[in-house]
Amino acid sequence: LTCLGGFASPGPVPPSTALRELIEELVNITQNQKAPLCNGSMVWSINLTAGMYCAALESLINVSGCSAIEKTQRMLSGFCPHKVSAGQFSSLHVRDTKIEVAQFVKDLLLHLKKLFREGQFN
């Protein structure tokens, strides 16, 4: 039964699909935004280097009680190879530079769209 269970469970999601789903979620957030996203919370800006997904997660995970970005946080954790917890500060963050969550999500979306167009799925 253990072996057969493996056949029933879906295989790993292709990186292109995962990225497309993350983009779609960010599009939903930006389009459905009525009140200020996460009450106008501020997060650290990030450098767009190899660890960009982890850095983005480390920024957003510090925003608590904001259901609008919970799915994004979960999806980003799938791109980040290590466990991320609130309060972590990565070298991938831009120190002393905080921006509104809404702008962060909007800019992350723009960047991910560019990556998708260029075929950079990881």
Epitope: S45, I46, N47, L48, I99, E100, Q103, F104, K106, D107, L108, L110, H111, K113, K114
Partner: nanobody, 118 residues
Framework: GVQLLESGGGLVQPGGSLRLSCAAS????????MGWARQAPGKGLEWVSS????????YYADSVKGRFTISRDNSKNTLYLQMNSLRAEDTAVYYC???????????RGQGTLVTVSS
């Protein structure tokens, strides 16, 4: 919110040089293609130069090619325009702006005045 703050403009003699800077804040600067536009007195807005997000692809209007150089420092959230061999016709207000095709990503600074006169 998003802010683009230009500096470095001023009065310069023909043949002289100026370096404009644009300090960006309130957004993830390194995501954006950026550029410089200008508006001469009584004229329309003219796109001068642009640079892609990574800083390795540039564009110049024919009127400034070979004289102006655009660059950026993503670690400092700053865009630059080095202007050499300035001419009277370069007199204008110079604006720093995002250069994205995507709707909703267009931001522009207040501008800095460059006057080329003897």
């Amino acid at each position: 919110g998003v802010q683009l703050l230009e500096s470095g403009g001023g009065l310069v003699q023909p043949g002289g040089s100026l370096r404009l800077s644009c300090a960006a804040s309130g957004f993830i600067f390194a995501v954006y293609d950026m550029g410089w536009a200008r508006q001469a007195p009584g004229k329309g807005l003219e796109w001068v130069s642009s640079i892609n997000d990574g800083g390795n692809v540039t564009y110049y209007a024919d009127s400034v090619k070979g004289r102006f150089t655009i660059s950026r420092d993503n670690s400092k959230n700053t865009l630059y325009l080095q202007m050499n061999s300035l001419r009277a016709e370069d007199t204008a207000v110079y604006y720093c702006a995002t250069a994205e095709d995507e709707p909703g990503y267009d931001y522009r600074g207040q501008g800095t005045l460059v006057t080329v006169s003897s």
